[in-house]
C-alpha cells in the first residue's frame, strides 16, 4: 500500500504520500485555533506508471496507454486514498469547543 508506513521509509519517486506539516497560524493565518498548533496534512505526488496502485480499470488502461505512448499527456494522477480526521480545540469567548474535522490527514495515495 502507498501509505505513510511505506512511503515515509522509502525513497520512492513514483506515486506516494509525502509529508507536509501545516502550521495553522503561520501557514494559513488561522490564529484562533488553540490546539494543535499544526499538523501533518501530507500530500500525494509522483508519476503513475503502469499497474502502480491502480484504482480502477480505467486507470490501469490509462497507465498502459501512457507506457506504450510516452508522448501522450494522458496518464493517471496520484491522489489521496485514505484520509483521517483531525480534532481541534478553539475558544468561543472563554468557552472551549472541540471539533473533529473530517478528511484532514492523507494516510495513503492511489493512482486514479
Amino acid at each position: 500500500a502507498l501509505d505513510t508506513n511505506y512511503c515515509f521509509r522509502n525513497l520512492e519517486e513514483n506515486c506516494c504520500v509525502r509529508p507536509l506539516y501545516i502550521d495553522f497560524r503561520q501557514d494559513l493565518g488561522w490564529k484562533w485555533v488553540h490546539e494543535p498548533k499544526g499538523y501533518y496534512a501530507n500530500f500525494c505526488s509522483g508519476p503513475c506508471p503502469y499497474l502502480r496502485s491502480a484504482d480502477t480499470t480505467h486507470s490501469t488502461v490509462l497507465g498502459l496507454y501512457n507506457t506504450l505512448n510516452p508522448e501522450a499527456s494522458a496518464s493517471p494522477c496520484c491522489v489521496p486514498q485514505d484520509l483521517e480526521p483531525l480534532t481541534i480545540l478553539y475558544y468561543v469567548g472563554r468557552t472551549p469547543k472541540v471539533e473533529q474535522l473530517s478528511n484532514m490527514v492523507v494516510k495513503s495515495c492511489k493512482c486514479s
Epitope: 494559513l28 493565518g29 490564529k31 484562533w32 468561543v92 469567548g93 472563554r94 471539533e99
Partner: antibody, heavy 121, light 111 residues
Framework: EVQLVQSGAEVKKPGASVKVSCKTS????????MNWVRQAPGAGLDWMGQ????????NYNEMFEGRVTLTADTSTSTAYMELSSLRAGDIAVYYC??????????????WGQGTLVTVSS | DIVMTQTPPSLSVSPRETASISCRAS??????????MHWYLQKPGQSPQLLIY???NLESGVSDRFSGSGSGTDFTLRISRVEANDTGVYYC?????????FGQGTKLELK
C-alpha cells in the same frame, strides 16, 4: 479591496423564511469567520452567529438558536443567513461582517451594506 | 450574557471640543492580558465601522483623534477636536464571553 456585497431587500409573510446572501471579494474567504448581525429599526446591534467557511463550523446566539442557519459556499466565496418562522419582531437590517481574524469571537473589521427584511401580511 | 451599558445615550458637542463616551460591562471582559472590548461608529445610513480594537488599538485608516482606554469593566472612547464627520451612533462590543454583545449605542451630534 475587501468587499462584502449583500442581496437586496426582502418582503416576507409571517411564518415564512428568508435567505440573505453575502458575496465576498478581496480576501481569502476560508481564512476568516463570517458573522451576522441584525439591527431593528432605530435600535442597536444584535449578534446572531458566525460561520467558519473552510468546513462550515458555526456558533449561534441562543436568542436565535433553532431559527437561524448559517451556510457558506467556498466555490463562490459567498455566505448565507437563513431565518425561519419570521415574525414582526424580525423586521430589521441584517449585516454580514468579517471577523478580525485573531479569535473565533472577535471584532468585525469589514461589513456588508445591509439587507432590509420586512415581515408583513 | 454580558450586558454592555453605554453613557450617555446621546451627546451634543461643539466642533473642536472633546467628546467622551463610557461603556460599562456587567462583568470583566479581560482575559489573557487583553481587554476584549471594541468600538464602532455607525454613520447615518451606513454600516458600522471599526474604530478601536482591544480597548486601545486604533484600527488602520482611522483618525488618531479617536482613542480608547480602560480595562476590566469600565472603558472610555475619546474623540478629540470633534468634526461634523464624527456624527453618528457609537457602539462598544465585547467578545470575552459567548454570545458577543454590543452596547445600546451613544448618539453623537454637533451643536
Amino acid at each position: 479591496e475587501v468587499q462584502l456585497v449583500q442581496s437586496g431587500a426582502e418582503v416576507k409573510k409571517p411564518g415564512a423564511s428568508v435567505k440573505v446572501s453575502c458575496k465576498t471579494s478581496g480576501y481569502t474567504f476560508i481564512t476568516y469567520w463570517m458573522n451576522w448581525v441584525r439591527q431593528a429599526p432605530g435600535a442597536g446591534l444584535d449578534w446572531m452567529g458566525q460561520i467558519f467557511p473552510a468546513w462550515g463550523s458555526t456558533n449561534y446566539n441562543e436568542m436565535f438558536e433553532g431559527r437561524v442557519t448559517l451556510t457558506a459556499d467556498t466555490s463562490t466565496s459567498t455566505a448565507y443567513m437563513e431565518l425561519s418562522s419570521l415574525r414582526a419582531g424580525d423586521i430589521a437590517v441584517y449585516y454580514c461582517a468579517r471577523g478580525y481574524g485573531n479569535y473565533a469571537l472577535d471584532a468585525m473589521d469589514y461589513w456588508g451594506q445591509g439587507t432590509l427584511v420586512t415581515v408583513s401580511s | 450574557d454580558i450586558v454592555m451599558t453605554q453613557t450617555p445615550p446621546s451627546l451634543s458637542v461643539s466642533p473642536r471640543e472633546t467628546a467622551s463616551i463610557s461603556c460599562r460591562a456587567s462583568e470583566s471582559v479581560d482575559s489573557y492580558g487583553n481587554s476584549f472590548m471594541h468600538w464602532y461608529l455607525q454613520k447615518p445610513g451606513q454600516s458600522p465601522q471599526l474604530l478601536i480594537y482591544l480597548a486601545s488599538n486604533l484600527e488602520s485608516g482611522v483618525s488618531d483623534r479617536f482613542s480608547g482606554s480602560g480595562s476590566g469593566t469600565d472603558f472610555t472612547l475619546r474623540i478629540s477636536r470633534v468634526e461634523a464627520n464624527d456624527t453618528g451612533v457609537y457602539y462598544c462590543q465585547q467578545n470575552n464571553e459567548d454570545p458577543l454583545t454590543f452596547g445600546q449605542g451613544t448618539k453623537l451630534e454637533l451643536k
